[in-house]
C-alpha cells in the first residue's frame, strides 16, 4: 500500500495482509531451521543410506536489504542460505554449534538451493531520484544434492557459492525447463 505515495512508473497493490499467509514467525535474521526432505523419514540404516530423500538440509533464514547501485529496497527481504553438510535427518543438530555434523563416507551430500521465488521490491534512491521497482530472485528452499567424484570443479564451486551466501539477485541459469512446481512455503509481503 505504501507504493501509492510515490509517483512511480509501476504501482504494486497488495491486498490486506490478513487475507494472505505471512512469513512464519521464525523468519528473523540468522535463525536456523532443520528441514527434512520428503517428510523427514528417518533411514532404517542411518550410516548406510544412499537415498538423497533420507537426508536433511540446514536452512538459515537471512534478512537483508536489496541494493542496486546507490538505491536500496524500502523493506528488507527474507531468504534462505543453504548451509553446511547434509546428513540423516534424525542426526542433524537443531542449532548451529550444537554437536558435530555427520559426514557420510563416500559420496558428499551438499545443501544447495532447490527452489526460488521472484519477489518484487521497491528501491528508494538518494538525491530525489524517483523510486524504482524490480523483481529479485530469492532462495525459497534448500535440498541435499549428492556429489560424487565425477562432478567437475565448476559445479562444486557453484554449490559452494550458493551455500555460502544469500542470492543478491538473479544468477545465470541453465537452459533446461522447470518441472511442474509445488506451492511456495515461504512468502513475504511482496
Amino acid at each position: 500500500q505504501g507504493w501509492q505515495a510515490f509517483k512511480n512508473d509501476a504501482t504494486e497493490i497488495i491486498p490486506e495482509l490478513g487475507e494472505y499467509p505471512e512469513p512464519p514467525p521464525e523468519l528473523e535474521n540468522n535463525k536456523t531451521m532443520n528441514r527434512a526432505e520428503n517428510g523427514g523419514r528417518p533411514p532404517h540404516h542411518p550410516f548406510e543410506t544412499k537415498d538423497v530423500s533420507e537426508y536433511s538440509c540446514r536452512e538459515l533464514h537471512f534478512t537483508r536489504y536489496v541494493t542496486d547501485g546507490p538505491c536500496r529496497s524500502a523493506k528488507p527481504v527474507t531468504e534462505l542460505v543453504c548451509s553446511g553438510q547434509c546428513g540423516p535427518a534424525r542426526l542433524l543438530p537443531n542449532a548451529i554449534g550444537r554437536g558435530k555434523w555427520w559426514r557420510p563416507s563416500g559420496p558428499d551430500f551438499r545443501c544447495i538451493p532447490d527452489r526460488y521465488r521472484a519477489q518484487r521490491v521497491q528501491l528508494l534512491c538518494p538525491g530525489g531520484e524517483a523510486p524504482r521497482a524490480r523483481k529479485v530472485r530469492l532462495v525459497a528452499s534448500c535440498k541435499c544434492k549428492r556429489l560424487t567424484r565425477f562432478h567437475n570443479q565448476s559445479e562444486l564451486k557453484d554449490f559452494g557459492t550458493e551455500a555460502a551466501r544469500p542470492q543478491k539477485g538473479r544468477k545465470p541459469r541453465p537452459r533446461a525447463r522447470s518441472a511442474k512446481a509445488n506451492q511456495a512455503e515461504l512468502e513475504n509481503a511482496y
Epitope: N8, D9, A10, E12, I13, I14, P15, E19, Y20, P21, D68, P113, D114, R115, Y116, R117, A118, R120, R132, A133, R134, K135, R137, A140, K168, G169, R170, K171, P172, R173, P174, R175, A176, R177, S178, A179, K180, A181, N182, Q183, A184, E187, Y190
Partner: antibody, heavy 125, light 111 residues
Framework: EVQLQQSGPELVKPGTSVKMSCKAS????????MNWVKQSHGKSLEWIGD????????TYNQKFKGKATLTVDKSSSTAYMQLNSLTSDDSAVYYC??????????????????WGQGTSVTVSS | DIVLTQSPASLTVSLGLRATISCKAS??????????MNWYQQKPGQPPKLLIY???NLESGIPARFSGNGSGTDFTLNIHPVEEEDAVTYYC?????????FGGGTKLEIK
C-alpha cells in the same frame, strides 16, 4: 502441456467496460505471475501489469492505472482483466502471459514464456 | 521508463545468410551480473513466442540458429542461417525494471 486460454473477441461501445479471462492449465497456477500485454493494431507491445495469484498482489504500469483492473480466481485457475471507460484507443489485442514466481533454477523466470492466443477488443459506437 | 530502440525497423536478408537485429536501451538493464533482455518472435495473428532470455539463453525448443548477446544497453539477436519461416517480426523486451517495456519491433524479410 502449459496452456493459457483466453476469452473470445469483444465489440463494445465507448464509455463502457469489458472483462476478459485467461484460463491456465498444465502448471500450478499460483507458481506464476500472470502478465497482461496490449498490442494495438500494427503496433508494438505494451506491458499493462501483472498479478501474483499466490498472494493477490498486483502491479500496474502507471499508464494503465485506473484503466485496467487485474484479478484472479484461484479455484478455477483463471485470471481476469477488466478495462474501464473504454475509448477507441483501447481497441487492441490483449494477451495474458505467465512469468515465474516460485521456481527452480532452470527457467527463464524473468521473461514471459507462455502466452494466451489473445483477446481482440474493438471499441466502436 | 526504460526505452528500447530496435534497429532496423525492417530488414531483408538472403536465405541462408545471417540476420542481425539491434536493441538499445535508454539505461542499463544489467543487475548483479546478469542482463535482463529477452527476445520474442511474433508471427501474424499469433502471440509472441519467447526465443532468448537473459540476453543470451536459448529458450527450450527454439532452434540453435537463434542466438543473443550483449550487456548493459546494447543487445543483438542473430539468426543464422536464416530460413523462410523466420520472415516475421521480432521484439526485444527488458525485465530489469518496472514497467517492463518492449522495443518497437523489427520485421524480417527473406529474399
Amino acid at each position: 502441456e502449459v496452456q493459457l486460454q483466453q476469452s473470445g473477441p469483444e465489440l463494445v461501445k465507448p464509455g463502457t467496460s469489458v472483462k476478459m479471462s485467461c484460463k491456465a492449465s498444465g502448471y500450478t497456477f499460483t507458481d506464476c505471475y500472470m502478465n497482461w500485454v496490449k498490442q494495438s493494431h500494427g503496433k508494438s507491445l505494451e506491458w499493462i501489469g501483472d498479478i501474483n495469484p499466490f498472494n493477490g498482489g498486483t502491479t500496474y504500469n502507471q499508464k494503465f492505472k485506473g484503466k485496467a483492473t487485474l484479478t484472479v480466481d484461484k479455484s478455477s485457475s483463471t485470471a481476469y482483466m477488466q478495462l474501464n471507460s473504454l475509448t477507441s484507443d483501447d481497441s487492441a489485442v490483449y494477451y495474458c502471459a505467465r512469468s515465474h514466481y516460485y521456481f527452480d533454477g532452470r527457467v527463464p523466470w524473468d521473461a514471459m514464456d507462455y502466452w494466451g492466443q489473445g483477446t481482440s477488443v474493438t471499441v466502436s459506437s | 521508463d526504460i526505452v528500447l530502440t530496435q534497429s532496423p525497423a525492417s530488414l531483408t536478408v538472403s536465405l541462408g545468410l545471417r540476420a542481425t537485429i539491434s536493441c538499445k536501451a535508454s539505461q542499463s538493464v544489467d543487475y548483479d551480473g546478469d542482463s535482463y533482455m529477452n527476445w520474442y518472435q511474433q508471427k501474424p495473428g499469433q502471440p509472441p513466442k519467447l526465443l532468448i532470455y537473459a540476453a543470451s539463453n536459448l529458450e527450450s525448443g527454439i532452434p540453435a540458429r537463434f542466438s543473443g548477446n550483449g550487456s548493459g544497453t546494447d543487445f543483438t539477436l542473430n539468426i543464422h542461417p536464416v530460413e523462410e519461416e523466420d520472415a516475421v517480426t521480432y521484439y526485444c523486451q527488458q525485465s530489469n525494471e518496472d514497467p517492463w517495456t518492449f522495443g518497437g519491433g523489427t520485421k524480417l524479410e527473406i529474399k
